[in-house]
């Protein structure tokens, strides 16, 4: 009689997570009588997957009825495959005995599990940064197999090149994780911008997964301040406005000071949005010129998004001659910038403005 051979025809089998895996095995002879066992791995630490003779293996079913006469098909089907099931499976013939004696093993079938990556999660910086600064965005996706994966970054549809990607672990594993960090230079126009992390994997059938982050969460656009003054009114009052322009986010407090004394404090709320996502706000102050003997120094102090206050000052000249309705302005902008004007250059006042 021919010597028994245990044949595992497939060297490898690839299965999607959640599906069933069929591991084929046939014996070439009915002799000797004895059971088949399936193991994952080799050596003393091998894991018993199925024992024809004894035990309870709820996820494993023999493909061929083991009670079938002259059965030499010992293939098994493993249901609900997960990445943890990956490994090399061996069909091993035993000779009947007390105990049964291991006789011959098949060559093994490597089971690889195709598992989809999780939806990419993109996280931005913990604190906001201003234009021209570089911020980092991180993209993470987990639980995929095999290890090969492609990750791309986009900003408003344009592919980014400044990023670093790691796939872990480096060695063999049942599943893998990817982490990528992209560096993005902010501009003042980025309030409506979006970064997208795109992950492509064999399990996704060419339909990549995307994770997004809004730059609105990462950016701070500091305001420009401008003063304007209307003509003196008949009641000797001058209307002075402080225009706070092109700022983001909306969180902003404005304080008027007359000769260094707080006159009024206001909080920005429910402002209309500019096309670019920034906000404008105008605040005005009526100055009663007749109540002052000397020139009035007005300061518009803006505290934006918890940052150090930005000041813009303005002098209202008190004239000696009487005022007439509709006459020319009796005040002039001295152009004093105690805390950087629209170009935000630092000055020497007690407030120190830190760029981020």
């Amino acid at each position: 009689e021919e010597e028994l051979q245990v044949i595992q025809p497939e060297k490898s089998v690839s299965v999607a997570a959640g599906e069933s895996a069929t591991l084929n095995c046939t014996a070439t002879s009915l002799i000797p009588v004895g059971p088949i066992q399936w193991f994952r791995g080799v050596g003393p630490g091998r894991e018993l997957i199925y024992h024809q003779k004894e035990g309870h293996f709820p996820r494993v079913t023999p493909v061929s009825d083991p009670t079938k006469r002259n059965n030499m098909d010992f293939s098994i089907r493993i249901s609900n495959i997960t990445p943890a099931d990956a490994g090399t499976y061996y069909c091993v013939k035993f000779r009947k005995g007390s105990p049964d004696v291991e006789l011959k093993s098949g060559a093994g079938t490597e089971l690889s599990v195709r598992a989809k990556p999780s939806a990419p999660v993109v996280s931005g910086p913990a604190v906001r940064a201003t234009a021209e600064h570089t911020v980092s965005f991180t993209c993470e996706s987990h639980g995929f197999s095999p290890r090969d994966i492609t990750l791309k970054w986009f900003k408003n549809g344009n592919e980014l090149s400044d990023f670093q990607t790691n796939v872990d672990p480096a060695g063999k594993s049942v599943s893998y994780s990817i982490r990528s960090t992209a560096r993005v230079v902010l501009t003042r126009r980025d309030v409506h911008s979006q970064v997208i992390c795109e992950v492509a994997h064999v399990t996704l059938q060419g339909d990549p997964l995307r994770g997004t982050a809004n730059l609105s969460e990462a950016i701070r656009v500091p305001p420009f301040l401008e003063f304007t003054q209307q003509s003196m009114r008949a009641d000797n009052q001058v209307n002075v406005t402080c225009q706070v322009m092109k700022f983001y986010p909306q969180r902003l407090q404005l304080t008027w000071l007359e000769n260094g004394n707080v006159s009024r404090t206001e909080m920005a709320s429910a402002l209309p949005e500019n096309k670019d996502g920034t906000y404008n706000w105008t605040s005005w102050l009526l100055v009663n010129v007749s109540a002052h003997r000397d020139d009035v120094k007005l300061t518009c102090q803006v505290e934006h998004d918890g940052q150090p206050a930005v000041n813009k000052s303005f002098s209202v000249k008190v004239s000696a001659h009487p005022k007439e309705q509709g006459s020319n302005t009796a005040a002039e902008n001295t152009g004093t910038n105690e805390r950087g004007s629209s170009d935000y250059k630092d000055d020497d006042d007690k407030h120190h403005h830190h760029h981020h």
Epitope: I31, V33, G34, Q52, E54, T67, N70, K96
Partner: antibody
Framework: QVQLVQSGAEVKKPGASVKVSCKAS????????INWVRQAPGQGLEWIAM????????HYNQIFKDRATLTTDTSTSTAYMELRSLRSDDTAVYYC????????????WGRGTLVTVSS | DIVLTQSPDSLAVSLGERATINCRAS??????????IFWYQQKPGQPPKLLIY???NLDSGVPDRFSGSGSGTDFTLTISSLQAEDVAVYYC????????FGQGTKLEIK
């Protein structure tokens, strides 16, 4: 360790029925056929029938087809053989035996149950 | 049905001598290269014990003084050197179709 433990001896009157049990242990009950064989005093072995516990498929010796019924209870890994319309020549030791190689052979045997039919 | 006929019905052999028991089938019990013949040993008060399967293969734990041979319709069980513990009744069985047993051969010491 495969074990087949059979029920105790029975004494029956002619025309009665007997149900012999065979409790299996040490292996997966549903993966192997159970055979029933009898042996009259001083006589040879006579095959009665076989059952596949996984799906209750049965094969009977024509001689016993109308009088014997094989059943199994997979929850207790127990096989049963009922013989009806007993006659005195049914007096025998009744064995259950497990077919380990699915070759329709008898690899492991119970110790037997003596059924005596006497008026 | 396939009928199995054993010969002789009884046999007396001296200790250490060879014992041979024959089993003839009424038609071939061979299929797909296998001979579906099995040999059993039964000692008084005990259930039968499988010795040989598929005509020539020794079952687990069976001493190698036992051997089986034959094909088609004619088969032989041989005990190469009889031991006292081999005294028993020996049966052949086929499974080419539904199983049947031979009538048995009683082996004694001469």
């Amino acid at each position: 360790q495969v074990q087949l433990v059979q029920s105790g001896a029975e004494v029956k009157k002619p025309g009665a029925s007997v149900k012999v049990s065979c409790k299996a242990s040490g292996y997966t009950f549903t993966n192997y056929w159970i055979n029933w064989v009898r042996q009259a005093p001083g006589q040879g072995l006579e095959w009665i029938a076989m059952i596949d516990p996984s799906d209750s498929e049965t094969h009977y010796n024509q001689i016993f087809k109308d009088r014997a019924t094989l059943t199994t209870d997979t929850s207790t890994s127990t096989a049963y053989m009922e013989l009806r319309s007993l006659r005195s020549d049914d007096t025998a030791v009744y064995y259950c035996a497990m077919d380990y190689g699915s070759l329709y052979a008898m690899d492991y045997w119970g110790r037997g149950t003596l059924v005596t039919v006497s008026s | 049905d396939i009928v199995l006929t054993q010969s002789p019905d009884s046999l007396a052999v001296s200790l250490g001598e060879r014992a041979t028991i024959n089993c003839r089938a009424s038609k071939s019990v061979s299929s797909s290269g296998y001979n579906y013949i099995f040999w059993y040993q039964q000692k008084p008060g005990q259930p039968p014990k499988l010795l040989i399967y598929l005509a020539s293969n020794l079952d687990s734990g069976v001493p190698d003084r036992f051997s089986g041979s034959g094909s088609g319709t004619d088969f032989t069980l041989t005990i190469s050197s009889l031991q006292a513990e081999d005294v028993a009744v020996y049966y052949c069985q086929h499974s080419r179709e539904l199983p049947t047993f031979g009538q048995g051969t009683k082996l004694e010491i001469k």
